[in-house]
Interface confidence: low
């Protein structure tokens, strides 16, 4: 997280830290006491594109709460993970839910609207481009989708598109994604924050929902927008996968 | 009971049979699992007017249900029993309430209105002037009080009153009493039915209430009306007596 | 933190016999509860009684037990939100 | 006629330990009931729980037990009433 604040109180108990092959820090989000969401890209870090979920599983290390190591049983990639940058992680044992470790809810309704504010926590790189040793969070507004597409692809018109990412890496942008950021204080997400939730507080229900999962964490206040996978598009697949496995 | 029907099913489980001194059959009504109402006149049968409750108690024999003998601990006469022809009987042990033995409720509201029908069961004399050996019952309408007073006392005007009972015995008639009978089939109560309840079924509550206790059982389809003590006038005294004893 | 008497330990698998009342009897019940941060998911009301075979059964769920499922999205110390 | 499991006999003063559920616990209760033709008169709701001293107590009535009082005016076989 570039800028933002330290999570002193443990306000993001769904936030997990995943160490990928060769020691890269990434994010994951607890969505039940035995399952987490992360990005497919996180899972494939330092693996070839042909790697299977079985190959990936033993290469991951996962921590929840205050550095509590949890064992992974299996990884399930989204069947269309090149378009929907998502994977599920199943733990060997259910975690004990406490004030430090608690899943975030998946939404039934769509909370995404331009200007709506969400909170993104993460273990990713900070303004010094170092991985943070204390969990941080930032408050980011949902962006206008067309502006985001123009920012990264020059145009919303297919034939006029070309790759214009200010950070030289292109996000996956489609109907399953939304964009958020940047704040006026130049606060943003950065490398290693992917897999974290775009958390929205439903005031009426007093409940926090993961409206999205950060997929493109390369903006780092250089590009203007982080890109997130819409959680409403995941819910059916998630529930089906959890029930089957 | 003159006419009426046999109680084949045990529909009057509050009905008790009391044998007074020298073997006369009378009625009593179970109002809790340890107390019964009867008439003061029943209690004084074959006793002098100066007899005390203590004198009367050992001379009585009491049966409930299907000839189940129960032991009497004490008798309590109404403090004004020459006007309110009532006494209470306390049993030595609580009876076990079953389908054959069950108290009737005392009413909080006044069910007595001319034409309203009640059921009177009894072990008293039948059309042959013999005591019945099977419990019988009759359905009787509440009478117009003025007609009843005229029937037994010639007039409702005090100075015009004289004793005109068709059966040569005068009932106690006052503000604590009501009259009921006769049916068009010449059905009536008779000697030995006194102490039995004028039972009214409250359809809303599906509960049977003793709206009155038969005091004057000498009509026997010769005179037109049986006379009953109003239960609403007894409730406070009954509850107080039961609590004290 | 559970209450002592709710989370009590039935060391000897027995509960003391409750006093008898005249013309009455007792029905033994257990009510399932969940620890903090969990909520009960049950087909019935979470209350179970002993049947003739001395099995704990619920009128709706039968012998099927309730579950304590993790609460989601209810952080104990939520972030201070800027209005 | 009472149901067997309502009027059951706790011969050995014990009730079998109910199954445990993950992240949950059980609260032991007894509910006082009355035999047929009696009804419960209680300061509380007739449900008693074991306190730390293993006494059966009701939250309202404390250790005071309910009573079964005779039902009145509810004959099992009422007279066939002519409408």
């Amino acid at each position: 997280i570039i800028g933002g604040s330290m999570d002193a109180k443990g306000s993001f108990p769904w936030q997990a830290k995943m160490i990928s092959r060769h020691g890269l820090t990434t994010g994951a989000t607890l969505i039940s006491d035995q399952w987490l969401l992360t990005t497919a890209k996180n899972l494939f870090l330092n693996h070839s594109e042909t790697a299977s979920a079985k190959d990936i599983t033993p290469t991951l290390t996962l921590y929840v709460g205050k550095n509590q190591l949890v064992e992974i049983e299996k990884v399930v990639l989204h069947p269309n993970h090149s378009v929907v940058d998502i994977g599920l992680i199943k733990l060997k044992q259910r975690v004990l839910v406490t004030e430090r470790v608690m899943p975030i809810c998946l939404p039934s309704k769509d909370y995404i609207a331009p200007g709506r504010v969400g909170y993104v926590s993460g273990w990713g790189r900070n303004a010094n481009f170092r991985f943070t040793d204390r969990l941080k969070y930032v408050m980011l507004p949902v962006a206008d989708q067309d502006k985001c597409v123009v920012h990264y692809e020059n145009s919303t018109v297919p034939e006029k598109k070309n790759l214009t990412s200010p950070v030289g890496v292109q996000p996956i942008l489609n109907e399953h994604t939304f964009c958020a950021g940047l704040t006026k204080y130049q606060e943003d997400t950065c490398y290693g924050d992917a897999g974290s939730a775009f958390a929205i507080h439903d005031m009426e229900e007093d409940t926090w929902y993961a409206a999205g999962i950060l997929s493109f964490d390369k903006s780092c206040a250089v590009a203007e927008y982080g890109v997130y996978v819409r959680a409403t598009d995941l819910k059916d697949w998630v529930q089906e996968t959890m029930a089957k496995n | 009971i003159i006419g009426g029907s046999m109680d084949a099913k045990g529909s009057f489980p509050w009905q008790a049979k009391m044998i007074s001194r020298h073997g006369l059959t009378t009625g009593a009504t179970l109002i809790s699992d340890q107390w019964l109402l009867t008439t003061a006149k029943n209690l004084f049968l074959n006793h002098s007017e100066t007899a005390s409750a203590k004198d009367i108690t050992p001379t009585l024999t009491l049966y409930v249900g299907k000839n189940q003998l129960v032991e009497i601990e004490k008798v309590v006469l109404h403090p004004n029993h020459s006007v309110v022809d009532i006494g209470l009987i306390k049993l030595k042990q609580r009876v076990l309430v079953t389908e054959r033995v069950m108290p009737i409720c005392l009413p909080s509201k006044d069910y007595i209105a001319p034409g309203r029908v009640g059921y009177v069961s009894g072990w008293g004399r039948n059309a042959n002037f013999r005591f019945t050996d099977r419990l019988k019952y009759v359905m009787l309408p509440v009478a117009d009080q003025d007609k009843c007073v005229v029937h037994y006392e010639n007039s409702t005007v005090p100075e015009k009153k004289n004793l005109t009972s068709p059966v040569g015995v005068q009932p106690i008639l006052n503000e604590h009493t009501f009259c009921a009978g006769l049916t068009k089939y010449q059905e009536d109560t008779c000697y030995g039915d006194a102490g039995s309840a004028f039972a009214i079924h409250d359809m809303e509550e599906d509960t049977w209430y003793a709206a009155g206790i038969l005091s004057f059982d000498k009509s026997c389809a010769v005179a037109e009306y049986g006379v009953y003590v109003r239960a609403t006038d007894l409730k406070d005294w009954v509850q107080e007596t039961m609590a004290k004893n | 933190v559970e209450l002592g008497n709710d989370a009590m330990d039935f060391e000897d698998d027995s509960c003391p016999k409750p006093p008898e009342i005249a013309n009455g009897y007792v029905e033994h019940l257990v009510r399932y509860r969940c620890r903090q941060f969990y909520r009960l998911r049950a087909e019935g009301d979470g209350v179970y009684t002993l049947n003739d075979e001395k099995q704990w059964v619920n009128t709706v769920a039968g012998e099927k037990l309730p579950e304590c499922e993790a609460v989601c999205g209810k952080p104990k110390h939520p972030v201070d939100q800027v209005q | 006629v009472e149901l067997g499991n309502d009027a059951m006999d706790f011969e050995d003063d014990s009730c079998p330990k109910p199954p445990e559920i993950a992240n949950g616990y059980v609260e032991h209760l007894v509910r006082y009931r009355c035999r047929q033709f009696y009804r419960l008169r209680a300061e509380g709701d007739g449900v008693y729980t074991l306190n730390d001293e293993k006494q059966w107590v009701n939250t309202v009535a404390g250790e005071k037990l309910p009573e079964c009082e005779a039902v009145c005016g509810k004959p099992k076989h009422p007279v066939d009433q002519v409408q």
Partner: antibody, heavy 121, light 108 residues
Framework: EVHLLESGGGLVQPGGSLRLSCQAS????????MSWVRRAPGKGLEWISS????????YTADSVKGRFTISRDNSKNTLYLQMNSLRAEDTAAYYC??????????????WGQGTTVTVSS | DIQMTQSPSTLSASVGDRVTITCRAS??????LAWYQQKPGKAPKLLIY???SLESEVPSRFSGSGSGTEFTLTISSLQPDDFATYYC??????????FGQGTNLEIK
């Protein structure tokens, strides 16, 4: 604006019954737990009953259990309290309250103005 | 059941004073404690939940602290509008909800 409006209070004789209603507006009623709380004259606040967004979750104070029943009609955005066998000690101002949380165990963030119940012969 | 004991029962203070009300639980309730304010003829108003979280639109002069069995409500600088009765309340999934007996804050 979030608003709760109670009705149905009044004078009733001991042993009688009343049904209180609470009309909710300004929030998603069917996602919220709701409660009834009362305050007797000269006494403190006393919780009566709570009902979850899912009506399986109902909790009732022992002092009224068996006499009072909480219910809700989400289609009408209305909370109810059916009060039977009323006693003199049930005389109080009755408040309907919205739980902060969607579950049945949380603090109450919004309260109605209250309706008065008087039990007297 | 949990018993909540509030002290003092009555508190006399002046505008500008710093006042503290204490609430003790008969057993640990973690941070599941709320504070309410009630004025005569009015509905109670939530001030603090989860022992120390300030309800929205409640002035910052109100603060709560504590966990386990000991809790306090502090008003840093008493305003004329603050004279009322204050209640603490324990709540969590182990119902019933238990209120303190109330503290009447009156003008000295």
């Amino acid at each position: 604006e979030v608003h709760l409006l109670e009705s149905g209070g009044g004078l009733v004789q001991p042993g009688g019954s009343l049904r209180l209603s609470c009309q909710a507006s300004g929030f998603t009623f069917n996602s919220n737990a709701m409660s009834w709380v009362r305050r007797a004259p000269g006494k403190g606040l006393e919780w009566i009953s709570s009902i979850g967004a899912n009506t399986n979750y109902i909790y009732t104070a022992d002092s009224v259990k068996g006499r009072f029943t909480i219910s809700r009609d989400n289609s009408k955005n209305t909370l109810y309290l059916q009060m039977n066998s009323l006693r003199a000690e049930d005389t109080a101002a009755y408040y309907c309250a919205k739980n902060r949380d969607r579950y049945s165990y949380d603090a109450w963030s919004v309260w109605g103005q209250g309706t008065t119940v008087t039990v007297s012969s | 059941d949990i018993q909540m004991t509030q002290s003092p029962s009555t508190l006399s203070a002046s505008v500008g004073d710093r006042v503290t009300i204490t609430c003790r639980a008969s057993q640990s309730i973690d941070i599941w404690l709320a504070w309410y304010q009630q004025k005569p003829g009015k509905a109670p108003k939530l001030l603090i939940y989860e022992a120390s979280s300030l309800e929205s639109e409640v002035p910052s002069r109100f603060s709560g602290s504590g966990s386990g069995t000991e809790f306090t409500l502090t008003i840093s600088s008493l305003q004329p509008d603050d004279f009322a009765t204050y209640y603490c309340q324990a709540y969590n999934s182990n119902y019933p909800y238990a209120f303190g007996q109330g503290t009447n804050l009156e003008i000295k």
